[in-house]
């Protein structure tokens, strides 16, 4: 293969791969017809002048996961055909000016996971055809004005995982073709008005895991093509009323892990394409009517781990397409009978870890497609007659860790549970809390005759048209099916990250097997 170095493997497709700790310099001679060269996991510490001079047909060059800390300015001379250059996962602290000069065809430049302390306008001034620039995982504290001014064709820019404390409002002004901008995991505390105004084609903006406290009202007003906006794990305490007003294409918005106390009216909208809204781990205390009413296509709404104690009966107006609603780990004590009335397509609802003492009999009356209901760890003593009767698709119902009162009023529920045991899961079954003589016994197998008879006036049945006779269950059996819904947690799926750690701690994401978030 035109002379393949012994430390490398060369394929017929003009691909050369050189790996191994014994390699301390760029191997020679490299095949003159090589189009792809990978130098990985070596002990190379520096690149001297023109080590690739004789392979001018090279299109892709990956020099990754080495000990590389120094590069001579002329290292990439004569690589005019090079389209892809990766220097990721090395130990570079400084880039020499002019390093990329002559790389007129370069489209992708990966400098991620090094130790770069600064970049200058002169570094990329020759890279006019660059489409992708990866700078994440360095030690950049500041991006000077003009740094990207010549990169007018850039479509993807990753500055995540640096030490940026502020961004100049002019630094992105010439990047009219940019589609993806990632600034996650920095130390940004605020973003000046106008910073994103030039990014008219932006589709993804990742600002999660910073220290942003305040969003300027018009920060995203020019980003009409934005589809994914990640604002999670910041210090945002309030959202200006018009901040999301001009985002008609948005389909994913993450705001979890902030300090939001309330959701201003009309804050979400109009966003006709929004499919997912992640709001867990905030300080929201109540949900007024119509707060989500502009989100007609929303399918996933995650409100878990807040402090919600009141939900207005019209809070979920407009959410006719919602599939997943997570309200677990809040401070809910009461739910108005109409609160879920609009959620005709709801499949999974999580209400565990609240303080619910009772449920309205018609709480699920319009929600015929429910497949999973999480009600564990509340203050429920009984459930209204017939509450699950119409839920033919229900296959997962969690009722454990409630103080069930096993007097004669529990019979209809007990009988229904007997017939529908598979839906309760095998991990934990509901047990009686009172009377004392049956405490701790399974609600399903309890002999109610030994329990104290009911001394309180029973509630009016929710479905009075369904007669109940003590010797027959009020809750008819329905076919038990297993839940197939599996939502993934909101991991921002970046193809340019070498590793993505997915936490499968369901308590973090908030649902059970059928639901994440």
């Amino acid at each position: 293969y035109h002379g393949c170095p012994s430390e490398c493997t060369c394929s017929r497709a003009s691909q050369v791969e050189c790996t191994g700790a014994r390699i301390v310099a760029v191997p020679t001679p490299l095949p003159w017809n090589a189009m792809s060269l990978q130098i990985l996991n070596t002990h190379i510490t520096e690149l001297n002048e023109s080590p690739f001079l004789n392979i001018s047909a090279l299109i892709a060059l990956r020099i990754e996961k080495n000990e590389l800390s120094r590069i001579t300015p002329g290292a990439f001379r004569n690589l005019g055909s090079l389209r892809y250059l990766s220097l990721a996962n090395n130990k570079l602290q400084v880039l020499p000016i002019g390093l990329f000069q002559g790389l007129d065809s370069l489209e992708s430049l990966l400098l991620s996971s090094n130790q770069l302390l600064q970049i200058q306008p002169a570094h990329f001034s020759q890279c006019s055809n660059l489409k992708e620039l990866q700078l994440h995982g360095n030690h950049l504290e500041y991006i000077p004005d003009g740094a990207f001014d010549h990169l007018v064709g850039l479509t993807k820019l990753n500055l995540g995982k640096n030490s940026l404390t502020h961004i100049s409002p002019r630094v992105f002004q010439h990047l009219g073709n940019l589609q993806v901008l990632r600034l996650y995991e920095n130390r940004l505390t605020d973003i000046p008005m106008g910073t994103f105004d030039g990014l008219v084609n932006l589709q993804e903006l990742a600002l999660q895991q910073n220290q942003i406290g305040l969003l300027s009202p018009g920060l995203f007003h020019n980003n009409h093509n934005l589809q994914r906006l990640y604002l999670s794990n910041n210090h945002i305490s309030q959202l200006p009323p018009s901040v999301f007003m001009q985002l008609p294409q948005l389909n994913r918005l993450t705001l979890f892990g902030n300090s939001l106390k309330e959701l201003s009216p009309g804050i979400f909208g109009p966003m006709p394409n929004l499919r997912e809204l992640w709001l867990y781990d905030n300080h929201i205390s109540s949900l007024p009517d119509n707060v989500f009413s502009n989100l007609r296509q929303l399918q996933v709404l995650i409100l878990s781990r807040n402090q919600i104690s009141f939900i207005s009966p019209g809070a979920f107006n407009g959410l006719t397409e919602l599939r997943e609603l997570s309200l677990h780990t809040n401070a809910l004590q009461d739910l108005d009978g109409n609160v879920f009335r609009m959620l005709a397509n709801l499949q999974n609802i999580s209400l565990q870890n609240n303080r619910l003492r009772q449920l309205p009999g018609n709480i699920f009356a319009n929600v015929n497609g429910l497949m999973a209901i999480q009600l564990q760890n509340n203050q429920l003593e009984n459930l209204p007659l017939g509450i699950f009767d119409h839920l033919g698709k229900l296959c997962e119902l969690r009722l454990y860790d409630n103080p069930w009162r096993c007097d004669s009023d529990i019979l209809p529920l007990r009988n229904w549970l007997l017939l529908n045991q598979p839906r309760l899961g095998t991990d934990t079954v509901p047990v009686c809390f009172s009377p004392a003589n049956v405490r701790g016994q399974s609600l399903i197998i309890i002999n109610v005759n030994v329990a104290v008879p009911s001394v309180h006036v029973p509630e009016v049945p929710s479905y009075p048209e369904t007669p109940w006779y003590p010797d027959t269950p009020s809750y008819p059996d329905t076919t038990s099916v297993s839940s197939t819904t599996e939502l993934t947690s909101p991991v921002e799926d970046y193809t340019d990250l070498t590793t993505i750690q997915v936490t499968d701690d369901r308590s973090v994401w908030g649902m059970t097997q059928a639901q994440s978030g």
């Epitope: 201003s264 009309g266 009517d289 119509n290 009966p313 019209g314 009978g337 009772q358 309205p360 509630e459």
Partner: antibody, heavy 118, light 107 residues
């Protein structure tokens, strides 16, 4: 159909208390919030607070906190609003009202006139 | 508390007239505004909710509009039974508050 029937008119002296009742019918009483709204003669409407009959939980307008108490008797499907330390400016018609599909008042009681006079 | 400023406080009109009543909230309440009609000695009656939705049984001559802070109730062609007092109410945040009322009288 939903009906809210209130107790009759009351005349009270300043400093006294009054307890107005509101009996609900035509729906499952424990499942929906009931509010109290008052209207002084020739004046506008003023929201006093709500009670959730299923649990007895309440939320009061700060203006009335410490003076108003809302309670429930599920056995008779009745909610009560007690206002203490009455003053002449508490003279008003007191309405109970139930929300519909939102936090607006779809169903109203007929009102109870409370007159505070020495 | 959110103030709801209603205007005019009273107006005189004739049967068949188009009547417009406005309500201004002291802060953004989204579309969480309702309009009520009240006749002497009677409880208020819900006309409009969510700023623009007619309650069931309410004639189509009644319409509502607005969002944020500015809201309007319009009676397109005043009928004899429409002479009453009209109130707006915000239900976006506690305490829920009402406007001062607009009395519509016969000219």
């Amino acid at each position: 159909q939903v009906q809210l029937v209130q107790s009759g008119a009351e005349v009270k002296k300043p400093g006294a208390s009054v307890k107005v009742s509101c009996k609900a019918s035509g729906y499952t009483f424990t499942d929906y919030y009931i509010n109290w709204v008052r209207q002084a003669p020739g004046q506008g409407l003023e929201w006093m607070g709500w009670i959730y009959p299923g649990s007895g939980n309440t939320k009061y307008n700060e203006k009335f906190k410490g003076r108003v108490t809302m309670t429930v008797d599920t056995s008779t499907s009745t909610v009560y609003m007690e206002l203490s330390s009455l003053r002449s400016e508490d003279t008003a018609v007191y309405y109970c009202a139930r929300w519909g599909y939102g936090a607006y008042f779809t169903y109203w009681g007929q009102g109870t006139l409370v007159t505070v006079s020495s | 508390d959110i103030q709801m400023t209603q205007s005019p406080s009273s107006l005189s009109a004739s049967v068949g007239d188009r009547v417009t009543i406005t309500c201004k909230a002291s802060q953004n309440v989204g579309i969480n505004v309702a309009w009520y009609q009240q006749k002497p000695g009677k409880a208020p009656k819900l006309l409009i909710y969510s700023a623009s939705y007619r309650s069931s049984g309410v004639p189509s001559r009644f319409s509502g509009s607005g969002s944020g802070t500015d809201f309007t109730l319009t009676i397109s062609s005043l009928q004899p039974e429409d002479f009453a007092t009209y109130y707006c109410q915000q239900y976006n945040s506690f305490p829920y508050t009402f406007g001062g009322g607009t009395k519509v009288e016969i000219k």
